[in-house]
């Protein structure tokens, strides 16, 4: 089963001190969304027990394997179902905690009920505050049963569930009619998928006989041990205040596990820690009782004393759960409850025994799950024990399961079952991922999904040039870090593969699939310099540059021009895609802007050194366009233009520029300056008779402004061909040739 514990702190005087903590003892638990496993999730489950909305609860992660929920503001926030989800893939497991209000009308005598398929389950709700109304039982939030209030027996309402089946599992509640749901008694019923003492798909396999209140898991036959006990059969007590599958966790606070409820994966459910009982787990066990919820009785013999955390403490000369076994009977010593080996290895397993008469090599044997008996190849005899060593044939997956070491002498016999887990070395399912590349190095993420078993202890990255027959280069890295492959050849393809290992002898897995990673081109090394530039308009700039002369071909694909507008904090980049280019026209720039300009050579995705920067000031943009431009023919060679001044001028106009062009003509237009900016009219002379002309105009302040609308007009008559248009402004009565 997954090593996952949900702890509820039940010191309920102040809901703000209440917290729930989910602790995982799994390797690599909760690291997040990397390849080694999803994070721990801890949340309130409002699907069945809905409580009034309150402020959001606070989730705090403490390291990689612990998450805590706080922020309860009122007692009703606590009532309901909480769940913690941990473990990866097929081992993903949900642990559930059901919290009852201590002030509810009805209280459960026992919250968690774990029963076997076919059993009768009895849920008992104790009357705490009587109401003379019906009691409604619900299952997973839906109506289930009604009891008349007279049906209470000894102040309890009982719900009998005969012949329960796994679908009967869930959250049950008992509520007085017309009482708040928060006043309900909430229960959790867990129905194992098999009858008592059996597990497996067809319930054909026999459970190992879990001790100290451990519950046999109906899927894998493992014992889910109560908090405070460990071992394949939960035969070993942890030190006081410790819990977890290997007793590796410690209860917080000075009073140990007092006031804490422990919830473990199904089919265990929840209980107090070892040595504690009561609805709030604050009462110590009565004399003669021990274990989780104080459910176990010591019944110590031969002078043994009862310890409420571990059970019988035997005097010297005696051992056994009740101190019923004499030390003269042979005894297996210090046998690990669980061993782990890698597939196809040939491990050595040791089994030590003591007794009187003294066990010898032939009196100790090892039995595999399939019934095969192994005899020891050698024995080490010491004054207080004999240790037999067994050489195990090459392991296969079917060797996973319960092995047994047995010692037999004329004084009696003893046996100890232990679990052997045969693990499959991990094999990457995907190729490593390229993160970044340079000309002589590749940065690679070796974290990939894998088949087989974790945890991953080492990652080896094998690489060599593509199509090469040379030996593979190998680099060993930490599982959680990215790898930089260095001293590579530029513009070269490399075949890269990952090999994963798990702890233990023979833990190296097969190599994963290869992937091709190519180093970048060599970096361009030449530094250009700016030859010059000139402004071709308020928003146009022509730039030219040079490169130093070097022997050999030019390493580069083109140039990158960069314009930095410091005022606005904006950068403009212009790509010139020919390495032969030495000039470029930059358009669409912002008039009146001070730019810093540089140029650099690029090759593939790599940039060479930038030229020394130049500073360029573009002239500001001109004024808006003149308004209402109108053309009127005066004769066969004269057309008068009239207009209105532009609006919203940024300064005084220095001149107007008129553009004249023959309509439909192919020739260049002619520009005529009107140097008296106060004018709103001018006469264009020297035009051809009976010819259609196009006119537009713009104003100038520091720079030229926008063009006005274009107007058309034809000259009159059929006169002689003029030499070309000229212009006359109307300034009072004067007529000046401009």
């Amino acid at each position: 089963a997954v090593d996952l514990t949900l702890l509820a702190n039940l010191r309920l005087t102040d809901p703000q001190r209440f917290f729930l903590t989910c602790v995982s003892g799994e390797a690599g638990a909760g690291r997040g969304s990397d390849a080694w496993g999803p994070p721990l999730l801890l949340e309130k489950d409002d699907r069945i027990v809905r409580t009034p909305p309150g402020p959001p609860l606070r989730l705090a992660r403490n390291g990689s394997h612990q998450v805590t929920l706080r922020g309860f503001s009122k007692p009703s926030d606590l009532v309901g179902v909480f769940s913690c989800v941990g473990g990866a893939g097929a081992r993903r497991t949900r642990v559930i905690y059901v919290h009852n209000s201590p002030g509810a009308h009805l209280l459960p005598d026992k919250v968690t009920h774990t029963v076997n398929k076919g059993d009768t389950a009895v849920l008992s709700a104790r009357v705490h505050k009587e109401k003379q109304t019906d009691v409604i039982w619900k299952s997973n939030g839906s109506y289930f049963y009604t009891l008349d209030w007279h049906e209470a027996q000894d102040g309890r309402f009982l719900l009998q569930l005969p012949n329960v089946q796994p679908p009967s599992s869930g959250i049950y509640s008992a509520t007085y009619l017309e009482a708040s749901p928060l006043g309900s008694a909430f229960f959790r019923l867990i129905v194992r998928g098999c009858g008592a003492g059996r597990w497996g798909p067809g319930c054909t396999k026999e459970c190992p006989g879990c001790l100290h209140g451990g519950v046999c898991h109906d899927h894998d036959g493992e014992c889910v041990c109560p908090p405070g006990f460990t071992g394949t059969r939960c035969e070993q007590a942890c030190r006081e205040g410790r819990f977890g599958q290997s007793c590796q966790e410690q209860c917080p606070g000075i009073s140990g596990c007092r006031g804490l409820t422990f919830c473990l994966p199904d089919p265990y459910g929840c209980s107090c820690g070892s040595g504690w009982r009561g609805s709030q787990c604050q009462e110590a066990c009565a004399p003669g009782h021990f274990g989780a919820d104080c459910r176990l009785q010591c019944q110590c013999q031969n002078g043994g004393t009862c310890d409420r955390f571990s059970g019988c403490v035997c005097p010297s000369g005696w051992h056994g759960v009740h101190c019923e076994k004499s030390d003269r009977i042979p005894q297996i010593l210090n046998m690990a409850s669980e061993l782990e080996f890698n597939l196809e290895t040939m491990p050595r397993i040791n089994c030590a025994a003591a007794g009187n008469p003294f066990p010898v090599r032939g009196s100790i044997e090892l039995r595999k799950p399939d019934g095969t008996v192994l005899l020891s190849t050698k024995a080490i005899v010491e004054p207080e024990k004999t240790t037999a060593e067994f050489e195990v044939p090459r392991l296969v997956l079917a060797d996973s399961g319960f092995w047994e070491c047995r010692v037999s002498t004329s004084g009696g016999q003893d046996s100890r079952r232990f679990k052997v887990n045969v693990k499959v070395p991990p094999v990457p399912l995907a190729a490593p991922r390229l993160l970044t590349k340079q000309s002589r190095q590749l940065v690679v993420s070796p974290l990939v999904s894998f088949s087989g078993d974790g945890p991953i202890s080492t990652v080896r990255l094998h690489y060599r040039p593509q199509d090469s027959t040379m030996d593979w280069s190998t680099i060993v890295v930490d599982p959680s870090e990215n790898v930089t492959l260095m001293n590579l050849r530029p513009k070269t393809g490399y075949s890269v593969r990952v090999q994963l290992s798990r702890p233990g002898e023979g833990g190296e897995g097969a190599w994963g699939p290869p992937t091709l990673m190519t180093t970048d081109c060599p970096e361009p090394l030449l530094q250009p310099w700016l030859e010059g530039w000139h402004v071709e308009g308020t928003d146009r700039l022509r730039v030219s540059w040079s490169l130093p002369l070097v022997p050999g071909p030019l390493v580069g694909d083109g140039f990158l021009l960069r314009l930095w507008d410091g005022t606005r904090g904006q950068e403009r980049r212009e790509n010139v895609s020919s390495p032969q280019a030495r000039t470029a026209l930059l358009t669409g720039l912002t008039p009146g802007t001070h730019y810093q300009l540089d140029v650099q050579l690029y090759h593939c995705t790599l940039l060479g050194p930038a030229s020394p920067p130049a500073h360029v000031l573009l002239p500001p943009s001109g004024p808006p366009a003149p308004r209402h431009l109108h053309a009127q023919a005066l004769s066969d060679s004269e057309i008068q233009l009239t207009w209105k001044h532009p609006e919203a001028l940024p300064g005084p106009i220095s001149k107007y520029v008129v553009e004249v062009q023959v309509a439909g003509g192919a020739g260049d237009p002619l520009w005529i300056d009107v140097d008296r900016p106060e004018e709103t009219s001018t006469i264009i002379r020297g035009l051809n008779a009976s010819t259609r002309y196009l006119f537009r105009m713009r104003a100038s302040i520091q720079g030229l402004g926008d063009w006005s609308n274009t107007v058309e007009e034809s000259t009159l008559g059929n006169g002689l061909q003029a030499e070309g248009p000229v212009q006359e402004s109307r300034a009072a009565e004067e007529g000046l040739d401009q």
Epitope: T146, H150, E151
Partner: antibody, heavy 117, light 110 residues
């Protein structure tokens, strides 16, 4: 689909007896409170009796107390109403009902009981 | 056996909204959130229309809505339709654990 089917109604003389039955289907009969409601011709609804799932607790309207007995057979999914010492004012359509928290969620089609000489 | 008080009849035109009241005491309507309403067409069995004051069973049109204020519960039928013409009874849980019905209201669609 929940179905309640009453039977056993008919004409009976004052002082006589009659036993109504209600066959239930489409739900787990043994988990529900069941009851009888009657409606005299042209009149409103009147609650008559109810019985809890275990069958051990029964309640009656004052107008029928001591004369009517409600019972159930959970193995047969059947509800009964034994009516003794019938009076003219017991003439009504009798409906079998399933009772949820505070309401009657399913009703049978009814069976007519006529008490007349 | 006491009853809850309802108007004998209520009528309305198609598309209109009508409201039926049901008055009891603090021992029934006012004391519990277990008011229910039943629709009964002539010659048919009653059918649950509203329960727990405001809740609608699946299959009942959302034109039917329930409410409660003090000792009086109300059933509102909006967008009245011809098929809504029927007798309507309110019901309540009582402090004695019993159930009591209203006197009934005949709804006529004009």
């Amino acid at each position: 689909e929940v179905q309640l089917l009453e039977s056993g109604g008919g004409l009976v003389q004052p002082g006589g007896s009659l036993r109504l039955s209600c066959a239930a289907s489409g739900f787990t009969f043994s988990r529900y409170v069941m009851g009888w409601v009657r409606q005299a011709p042209g009149k409103g609804l009147e609650w008559v009796s109810r019985i809890y799932p275990s069958g051990g607790f029964t309640y009656y309207a004052d107008s029928v107390k001591g004369r009517f007995t409600i019972s159930r057979d959970n193995s047969k999914n059947t509800l009964y109403l034994q009516m003794n010492s019938l009076r003219a004012e017991d003439t009504a359509v009798y409906y079998c009902t399933r009772i949820r928290e505070g309401y009657f969620d399913y009703w049978g089609q009814g069976t007519l009981v006529t008490v007349s000489s | 056996q006491y009853e809850l008080t309802q108007p004998a009849s209520v009528s309305g035109s198609p598309g209109q909204s009508i409201t039926i009241s049901c008055t009891g005491t603090s021992s029934d309507v006012g004391g519990y959130n277990y008011v229910s309403w039943y629709q009964q067409h002539p010659g048919k069995a009653p059918k649950l229309t509203i329960f727990d004051v405001t809740k609608r069973p699946s299959g009942v049109s959302d034109r039917f809505s329930g409410s409660k204020s003090d000792n009086t519960a109300s059933l509102t039928i909006s967008g009245l339709q011809a098929e809504d013409e029927a007798d309507y009874y309110c019901g309540s849980y009582t402090s004695s654990g019993s159930r009591v019905f209203g006197t009934g209201t005949k709804v006529t669609v004009l």
